[in-house]
């Protein structure tokens, strides 16, 4: 029950996280301009990964997409790549985790297969979350660097023909959305990995049934011959819980791939 809950919660948390990563990637407010007034009127500029927008104090907004002519910084391209990789990995992870959910029955899928799928999706969510956090952090670093550069270099000129105004850019809403979303995806991934441990078949907690073959006294139980002869190594010195009764099965084998009901 706890495993199902952990897996389900991990899935939901990751789903919210990935939705957030997608939202952050599409948002225009990655960098917003520090309050700056043009001598004429207040026109604010805010920029995303894909386009730049200007907004008047009246609320009128115009956005234009970046074009190759601008020679965008390599860092921006890297941020775009990280966010897209994060989304793709997250989407695949979601798809895998749907089939891995314990509450969903698909044919005669074994628990071991579900455990593997849960682990796979968990790892994908963790990497997806890390990609998003890395992407947002790289952009934030660009902003901080730009902020101090523009503070130090207030006015530059080409014979008075160009004037770099105090247009310092600060963290936009998308950065916070990205950080939170990346964190949620990461947490969801960890939860899926934890759930995987609970899903993975462990040592059996039932009494093995002894079948006496004519000639040799050999006890067979699910898990193969090596576990049934009574000569196996007993490094763990564990006993199967049997409510106090003793059986001839005192030697506990290591769990094998098929050691479950």
């Amino acid at each position: 029950m706890a495993v199902t809950a952990c897996q389900g919660l991990g899935f939901v948390v990751s789903l919210i996280g990935i939705a957030g990563i997608i939202a952050a990637t599409c948002m225009d407010q990655w960098s917003t301009q520090d309050l700056y007034n043009n001598p004429v009127t207040a026109v604010f500029n805010y920029q995303g990964l894909w386009r730049s927008c200007v907004r008047e104090s009246s609320g009128f907004t115009e956005c234009r997409g970046y074009f190759t002519l601008l020679g965008l910084p390599a860092m921006l391209q890297a941020v775009r790549a990280l966010m897209i990789v994060g989304i793709v990995l997250g989407a695949i992870g979601l798809l895998v985790s749907i089939f891995a959910l314990k509450c969903i029955r698909i044919g005669s899928m074994e628990d071991s297969a579900k455990a593997n799928m849960t682990l796979t999706s968990g790892i994908m969510f963790i990497v997806s979350g890390l990609c998003a956090i890395a992407g947002v952090s790289v952009f934030a670093n660009m902003l901080v660097t730009n902020f101090w550069m523009s503070t130090a270099n207030m006015y530059t000129g080409m014979g008075g023909m160009v004037q770099t105004v105090q247009t310092r850019y600060t963290f936009g809403a998308a950065l916070f959305v990205g950080w939170v979303a990346g964190g949620l995806t990461l947490i969801g991934g960890v939860m899926m990995c934890i759930a995987c441990r609970g899903l993975a078949p462990e040592e059996t907690n039932y009494k093995a049934v002894s079948y006496h073959a004519s000639g040799h006294s050999v006890a067979y139980k699910p898990g193969g011959f090596k576990a049934s002869t009574g000569f196996g190594s007993n490094t763990k010195n564990k006993k199967i819980y049997d409510g106090g009764a003793r059986t001839e099965d005192e030697v506990q084998s290591y769990p094998s791939k098929h050691d479950y009901v």
């Epitope: 920029q47 008047e56 009246s58 965008l72």
Partner: nanobody, 120 residues
Framework: QVKLEESGGGLAQAGGSLRLSCAAS????????MAWYRQTPGRQRELVAA???????DYADAVKGRFTISRDSAKNTVYLQMNDLKSEDTAVYYC??????????????WGQGTQVTVSS
């Protein structure tokens, strides 16, 4: 990066008209504001008229009702229609553009200026 090309200046009679135009070219992402300033010898540069990307306009009190600023966003061009010219309108008119040129880059550019002379 961004070049502002002014045209339309010259000599005009008092009460006459002139139309100035300023075309912005180069690496332009968004033009936030385009404006016209003027400067007479010994005086500071003063704002004449300005227009935002959304079409909001602002005029100096001395030119209100006589001058009209307009823009063509597609051509990144701003126009200043000057009617009922007075001798005090004689000055060098400068085009100004507040431009977003790239990621985290917003600069103010100035044109070379065009002379407007009003004879009485």
């Amino acid at each position: 990066q961004v070049k502002l090309e002014e045209s339309g200046g010259g000599l005009a009679q008092a009460g006459g008209s002139l139309r100035l135009s300023c075309a912005a070219s180069g690496r332009i992402l968004n033009i936030a504001v385009m404006a016209w300033y003027r400067q007479t010898p010994g005086r500071q540069r003063e704002l004449v008229a300005a227009i935002t990307f959304g079409g909001s306009t602002d005029y100096a009190d001395a030119v209100k009702g006589r001058f009209t600023i307009s823009r063509d966003s597609a051509k990144n061009t701003v126009y200043l229609q000057m009617n009922d010219l007075k001798s005090e309108d004689t000055a060098v008119y400068y085009c100004n553009a507040d431009v977003v040129t790239g990621l985290m880059r917003r600069d103010v550019y100035w044109g070379q200026g065009t002379q407007v002379t009003v004879s009485s």
